[in-house]
Interface confidence: medium
């Protein structure tokens, strides 16, 4: 029997053992987070699968993910949302120490999908482990991109109080309008619930004492946020290593001076 023709995409294929990984992550998450113990992980997987299986992987919509979003509904306390852009590892290190703050990947749906790739094929129940659409080379409406756009929108919409965002000061565009933060989250913060957005610009170089809050892209972010009737503030984190150390050991005498 000849193997059936399969669409060849430019991106890497579905992560191996994808169904098992999602299910295992779900079980682990619900065990660790008592407020999510009511979640039925088999239903979560069914809803996840239903969003992309048998569908043309360049024609996925946010609507496809709504059953999953509904099952994964979670709220973050006001002042405890941490967004990030191009600096995921430090953001996650921070919330691992500062346990009362949350990135999207600390929430159930973000935790399930973090670092995974997935896609299906039109009219078959198979998962494509060979290749999946690349956002640039193939299409933007692919299962992974649409998932992150959907859950990022929801995460931003439900944020309240003072919202923080960690930005990478080593990049040419510290604030990038084309990033998920710049294209989705910024525009879905709700002015009637969000008091302020505070950007933490993380410096890369040890001797870098410039005020990156004066960077033109940060001024652009300030303009976008202010026009949405949300206050904007910015802080330089000159020493990310010291920053994390001081979060871990706040009473350390060296933490009384600036970071």
């Amino acid at each position: 029997v000849l193997p059936r023709w399969r669409q060849q995409w430019s991106g890497s294929g579905t992560t191996s053992r994808f169904p098992e990984t999602v299910l295992a992550r779900c079980v682990k998450y619900t065990e660790v987070h008592p407020e999510m113990r009511h979640v039925d992980c088999q239903s979560v997987w069914d809803a996840f699968k239903g969003a992309f299986i048998s569908k043309y992987p360049c024609n996925i919509t946010e609507e496809d993910y709504q059953p999953l979003v509904k099952l994964g509904t979670q709220t973050v306390p006001c002042n405890k949302t941490l967004l990030w852009s191009r600096i995921k590892d430090l953001a996650h290190q921070f919330t691992q120490v500062q346990r009362d703050m949350f990135t999207l990947e600390d929430m159930l749906l973000g935790y399930l999908a973090d670092d995974l790739t997935w896609c299906g094929e039109f009219n078959t129940f198979e998962i494509n482990y060979q290749s999946c659409p690349d956002w640039r080379k193939d299409c933007s409406n692919n299962p992974v991109s649409v998932f992150w756009k959907t859950v990022s929108r929801r995460f931003a919409e439900t944020a309240c109080g003072v919202v923080h965002v960690m930005l990478n000061g080593s990049r040419s565009k510290i604030f990038d309008k084309n990033s998920t933060f710049g294209s989705v989250e910024v525009h879905n913060l709700q002015p009637e619930k969000v008091q302020a957005l505070e950007a933490w610009v993380i410096h890369g170089g040890r001797e870098d004492s410039r005020d990156l809050c004066q960077d033109p892209t940060i001024k652009e972010l300030e303009s976008i946020i202010s026009k949405r009737n949300i206050r904007f503030f910015c802080k330089n984190i000159y020493r990310p290593d010291k920053f994390l150390q001081c979060v871990k050991n706040p009473e350390d005498s060296s933490c009384l001076s600036g970071i």
Epitope: C78, D100, C160, G161, Q190, Q195, N229, F233, E251
Partner: antibody, heavy 120, light 110 residues
Framework: EVQLLESGGGLVQPGGSLRLSCAAS????????MNWVRQAPGKGLEWVST????????YYADSVKGQFTISRDNSKNTLYLQMNSLRAEDTAVYYC?????????????WGQGTTVTVSS | QSVPTQPPSASGTPGQRVTISCSGS????????VYWYQQVPGTAPKLLIY???QRPSGVPDRFSGSKSGTSASLAISGLQSEDEADYYC???????????FGGGTKLTVL
């Protein structure tokens, strides 16, 4: 001129209720988070409650939770504080205050205050 | 401790420099901005310092704020008789999810 004008204070018996109002003028009321702060006779300032610009986010001091309700009507540029089950320790001057746009928790404009006396 | 602590009273003579302290904890002063309010008896409070050390327009530069760790200070230089008032520090407390005021310091100009 930016102004806040409180009203609705007065003498009330223990267990009674009062509704305070704060009329705002001279600024875009619907864009600002608003607060109630009180001061008992001869005592210091005590934060009571905060409400977000759209009214969907609300904070209360533990001392008034379940007893006071903050609300706002942006179409009328008015902030409210509904006070129920009043006790002698609620006797105070009640101030409404607007948040400073330039930071998070500073209050840059205050009303002149309205006096609430709880006594039998 | 939950509520920031201030000395109940302070005093100085005209022209002198006076400092008022405000001591808190990591959940309030250290991790959040500090504000200072001036209240002349019988009047509403007035914002004097915001975001640790910023002065609103109209506040004389004789008033300055500073913060180190879990403590904050308000310094008044060139003391004048009209500075006689109650001074309150305030901040947000992340553990209580509440705004908190210090107990207040009564400043007397001798």
């Amino acid at each position: 001129e930016v102004q806040l004008l409180e009203s609705g204070g007065g003498l009330v018996q223990p267990g009674g209720s009062l509704r305070l109002s704060c009329a705002a003028s001279g600024f875009d009321f619907s864009s600002y988070w608003m607060n109630w702060v009180r001061q008992a006779p001869g005592k210091g300032l005590e934060w009571v409650s905060t409400i977000s610009s759209g009214g969907s986010i609300i904070y209360y001091a533990d001392s008034v939770k379940g007893q006071f309700t903050i609300s706002r009507d942006n179409s009328k540029n008015t902030l409210y504080l509904q006070m129920n089950s009043l006790r002698a320790e609620d006797t105070a001057v009640y101030y409404c205050a607007k948040d400073n746009w330039n930071d998070y928790y500073g209050m840059d404009v205050w009303g002149q205050g309205t006096t609430v006396t709880v006594s039998s | 401790q939950s509520v920031p602590t201030q000395p109940p009273s302070a005093s100085g003579t005209p022209g002198q420099r006076v400092t008022i302290s405000c001591s808190g904890s990591s959940s309030n002063i250290r991790d959040n901005y500090v504000y200072w309010y001036q209240q002349v008896p019988g009047t509403a409070p007035k914002l004097l310092i915001y975001k640790d050390d910023q002065r609103p327009s109209g506040v004389p530069d004789r008033f300055s704020g500073s913060k180190s760790g879990t403590s904050a200070s308000l310094a008044i230089s060139g003391l004048q008789s009209e500075d006689e008032a109650d001074y309150y520090c305030a901040t947000w407390d992340g553990s209580l999810n509440a705004r908190v005021f210090g107990g207040g310091t009564k400043l007397t100009v001798l």
